[in-house]
């Protein structure tokens, strides 16, 4: 039985050219997290964090994606094309798969909201 819940940064915004942290947190379960996958809006993989083998960043993103903090992901040098949905998928044992969603809006304006505590100035 899956008892866990995923908490995410929800809807966040950041400035073009800036950086942002995407963060998910799995709670209310004792399940072992074996892997966390981060996907972009088109469901292409950005990164994988395997519990035993560590981080793997998709080659096309290696200059703009940094692992962490924790199981989160830092996106750098943001462009308008980065606007959209991001998904964290927690693969766990014995529960199975948990999935969280974050919506990132990249703003041209310098008045980008600093709404999320995970945001990097």
């Amino acid at each position: 039985m899956m008892t866990g819940t995923i908490e995410t940064t929800g809807n966040i915004s950041a400035k073009k050219g800036g950086s942002v942290i995407l963060q998910c947190h799995l709670s209310s379960t004792m399940a072992q997290v074996t892997q966390v996958n981060w996907e972009q809006h088109d469901h292409s993989l950005l990164a994988i964090r395997n519990a035993e083998l560590g981080w793997h960043i998709y080659p096309a993103f290696k200059d703009r994606v940094a692992p962490g903090p924790g199981l989160g992901l830092t996106l750098q040098s943001l462009t308008m094309n980065d606007t959209g949905e991001y998904f964290c998928t927690y693969h766990t044992y014995p529960d199975g798969t948990y999935r969280g969603r974050i919506f990132l809006e990249v703003l041209e304006s310098s008045v980008a909201e600093h709404s999320a505590r995970f945001q990097i100035p």
Partner: antibody, heavy 121, light 108 residues
């Protein structure tokens, strides 16, 4: 050319251990994962685990945890798979295969010739 | 774990005909899917990776398609050397990486 050469066939008694070697040549040994896959007679392919030859990090299928150990010797570009507490169901051909670069993930593009392990009393 | 299901288990095709093999993942694997060919007494051989990219030296008659959970391997015109067992495999979540049960392509 790129190749993986495995050790020869083995016959073991139930309860014993077997250690199969896989020698890589023709490429930068530490840069690619090595996987172990087995195939029982007349059956499909079963993934056993993976080793990062650069760091020695391993990840094993839950089914084999506690019975399998994968190690490497970077000086000879050789990976080893040891399976203990053998039973008749472990009778199979054991393959090593090269996976993707250790910075990302990938399909198994180069396979060893296979090592037949027979467990019989 | 991600379960890979292949269909059909056996496919009977005449030489020169088209063969279509299916593979379904129990959850999305994006395009991180490979196809392998295995002949009796031999090690598997990589045919397709990234769901649709042919491996080095693989003839153009082999093509892969699909993304997410549904994938297809097509052999446009079967040659005598193509009769074999074909396996799909996801390589995005481990442990364990998982293979399908295989599809045997036999001569009709």
């Amino acid at each position: 050319q790129v190749q993986l050469v495995q050790s020869g066939a083995e016959v073991k008694k139930p309860g014993a251990s077997v250690k199969v070697s896989c020698k890589a040549s023709g490429y930068t040994f530490p840069a690619y994962y090595i996987h172990w896959v087995r195939q029982a007679p007349g059956q499909g392919l079963e993934w056993m685990g993976i080793i990062n030859p650069s760091l020695g990090l391993t990840s094993y299928a839950r089914k084999f945890q506690g019975r399998v150990t994968m190690t490497r010797d970077t000086s000879t570009s050789t990976v080893y798979m040891e399976l203990s507490s053998l039973r008749s169901e472990d009778t199979a051909v054991y393959y090593c295969a090269r996976g993707g670069r250790t910075t990302w993930i990938g399909a198994l593009d180069i396979w060893g010739q296979g090592t037949m392990v027979t467990v019989s009393s | 774990e991600i379960v890979m299901t292949q269909s059909p288990a056996t496919l009977s095709v005449s030489p020169g005909e088209r063969a279509t093999l299916s593979c379904r993942a129990s959850q999305s694997v994006s395009s991180n899917l490979a196809w392998y060919q295995q002949k009796p007494g031999q090690a598997p051989r990589l045919l397709i990776y990234g769901a649709s990219t042919r491996a080095t030296g693989i003839p153009a008659r082999f093509s892969g398609s699909g993304s997410g959970t549904e994938f297809t391997l097509t052999i446009s015109s079967l040659q005598s050397e193509d009769f074999a067992v074909y396996y799909c495999q996801q390589y995005v979540v481990w442990p364990p990486l998982t293979f399908g049960g295989g599809t045997k392509v036999e001569i009709k």
